[in-house]
């Protein structure tokens, strides 16, 4: 996926098609959720403004064996300009709060939808 600079985001912002597809995947996850997502696994909360895509991937990549978010992990890896591996925390986010994966996905979705509606993908 091509990553383009956003209007107000320091990190890379994907073009509209890629962003919309990520939003759709996150919506699918939240709407199809029956049992606790990823068995209630906890991940680091991230800063949703700076280096968001890499930070989100760095947080989620530490969840293993959860097929529900594998596609999201793959999509986020396309948005992040550097390779991310488990245990890596180089992007701008504060490791002081852990939240459930389900809440992480909801927060990320809300923010991405706002970016999309504002047109922040060019």
């Amino acid at each position: 996926l091509t990553c383009l600079g956003g209007f107000a985001s320091p990190g890379p912002v994907p073009p509209s098609t890629a962003l919309r597809e990520l939003i759709e995947e996150l919506v699918n996850i939240t709407q199809n959720q029956k049992a606790p997502l990823c068995n209630g696994s906890m991940v680091w909360s991230i800063n949703l403004t700076a280096g968001m895509y890499c930070a989100a991937l760095e947080s989620l990549i530490n969840v293993s064996g959860c097929s529900a978010i594998e596609k999201t992990q793959r999509m986020l890896s396309g948005f992040c300009p550097h390779k991310v591996s488990a245990g890596q925390f180089s992007s701008l986010h504060v490791r002081d709060t852990k939240i459930e994966v389900a809440q992480f996905v909801k927060d990320l979705l809300l923010h991405l939808k706002k970016l999309f509606r504002e047109g922040q993908f060019n």
């Epitope: 919309r20 939003i23 759709e24 939240t30 979705l109 939808k113 706002k114 509606r117 047109g119």
Partner: antibody, heavy 123, light 107 residues
Framework: QVTLKESGPGILQPSQTLSLTCSFS??????????VDWIRQPSGKDLEWLAH???????RYNPALKSRLTISKDTSSSQVFLMLASVDTADTATYYC???????????????WGQGTSVTVSS | DIQMTQTASSLSASLGDRVTISCRAS??????LNWYQRKPDGTVKLLIY???RLHSGVPSRFSGSGSGTDYSLTISNLEQEDIATYFC?????????FGGGTKLEIK
Amino acid sequence: QVTLKESGPGILQPSQTLSLTCSFSGFSLSTSDMGVDWIRQPSGKDLEWLAHIWWDDVKRYNPALKSRLTISKDTSSSQVFLMLASVDTADTATYYCARIVSSGYIYYALDYWGQGTSVTVSS
Amino acid sequence: DIQMTQTASSLSASLGDRVTISCRASQDIRNYLNWYQRKPDGTVKLLIYYTSRLHSGVPSRFSGSGSGTDYSLTISNLEQEDIATYFCQQGNTLPLTFGGGTKLEIK
């Protein structure tokens, strides 16, 4: 039951500012994923999207008219407003407001429409 | 802007007929295609969104299909109340754009 109703001046002169009101019921613009659009149709021409406003006050405009358009809302009174500055005879049209489909996805589909209000620009 | 073209500005059909109305986009709109019905009294209703999803309360005789740049609306068993003008609209990118409409008439 969702309803929307447009109101406007009916007739105005060139160079004046057109002010339109969309009064709605059956939903709230304080609810997540809710939005309202304005569309117009000049006689014998295609429908033209003008602008929309979302529950969180995100606004988008048709680039062709952006410099003349202002959209706003009053959530408490369930109204959305559109102002079109420096009107000309080409702005003569039926103006509609419509609600954006509310779901997790962003379809940009309009599920409920007002009946439209006719606006004539004439000197 | 994405141009939406409905080649048939009018169609004539008999009650009970299967009617297909087509719509073409100037570029791939990734199934973000919506169909509307405008009755002679000016009432506009959403029929189909995202190519093939039926809006609530819309009779099942209406269906939509297509992909890429070519889309269609089908009415399987034309009824008198279906006499109206039908518009397509792309929701892939802003500005939202509409087709010119296809007016459906009874033979």
